[in-house]
């Protein structure tokens, strides 16, 4: 699982790439995306 902290501090990533990784994680974990 990828934590929000890890994602937000992953430098050099586009905002869409962060959304992409969040969404892929959401599809697996069913966390709320809002």
């Amino acid at each position: 699982a990828v934590s929000e902290h890890q994602l937000l501090h992953d430098k050099g990533k586009s905002i869409q790439d962060l959304r992409r990784r969040f969404f892929l994680h959401h599809l697996i974990a069913e966390i709320h995306t809002a």
Partner: antibody, heavy 118, light 115 residues
């Protein structure tokens, strides 16, 4: 190894319904989001629907929203696509696909052909 | 509007290097995309995801002859020492989540012929 086998395709008249199935094996089905992607004869790919691992969240493009419903039965390791009010433009090979932690459509089935014609 | 543009076809000599281009709509130039290979009469196969900085992760069973790179809104798929089995349609795709809705679009694909 990951295996996805689609079934349920065939010839159907415009306005009628059809339900596709995708039998999954070789992985823990309940742990991954699943999708349907279609390809009209001689045309490109079009994303049709996505469902989360437990089935709580579903996503559709405007072209099928309100007509198609994606669902899953994790006890049967099976993904479904209920297609209502079918149109000629829905004629396509329908593929099911499995996500990974890295990408949306990492593994694909062989596809099932749906022909909408009177 | 999220759009991917690909040239329709390209031909390469056996053993040559090939470079295919997928261009994002200008306002989406930072986006991560995916590349897929579809051999004739077969389902698509995931090749790689390709980020803005050119970093990429390849799918299962993809030879290391396949690599990716990026420049601005362009995303490149390179094939070194191209082989007969590489003759296929190569399709790029991109997804995004907007207001809790998911969208995913594919490019039209580039048909690669190996001479």
């Amino acid at each position: 190894q990951v295996q996805l086998v689609e079934s349920g395709g065939g010839v159907v008249q415009p306005g009628r319904s059809l339900r596709l199935s995708c039998a999954a094996s070789g992985f823990t089905f309940s742990s991954y989001g699943m999708s349907w992607v279609r390809q009209a004869p001689g045309k490109g790919l079009e994303w049709v629907a996505t469902i989360s691992s437990g089935g709580s969240y579903t996503y559709y493009p405007d072209s099928v929203k309100g007509r198609f419903t994606i669902s899953r039965d994790n006890s049967k390791n099976t993904l479904y696509l209920q297609m209502n009010s079918l149109r000629a433009e829905d004629t396509a090979v329908y593929y099911c696909a499995r996500q990974t932690t890295m990408t949306y459509f990492a593994y694909w089935g062989q596809g099932t052909l749906v022909t909408v014609s009177s | 509007q999220l759009v991917l543009t690909q040239s329709s076809s390209a031909s390469f000599s056996l053993g040559a290097s090939a470079k295919l281009t997928c261009t994002l709509s200008s306002q989406h130039s930072t986006y991560t995309i995916e590349w897929y290979q579809q051999q004739p009469l077969k389902p698509p196969k995931y090749v790689m995801d390709l980020k803005q900085d050119g970093s990429h992760s390849t799918g299962d069973g993809i030879p290391d002859r396949f690599s990716g790179s990026s420049s601005g809104a362009d995303r490149y798929l390179s094939i070194s020492n191209i082989q007969p089995e590489d003759e296929a349609m190569y399709i790029c795709g991109v997804g995004d989540t907007i207001k809790e809705q998911f969208v995913y679009v594919f490019g039209g694909g580039t048909k690669v012929t190996v001479l």
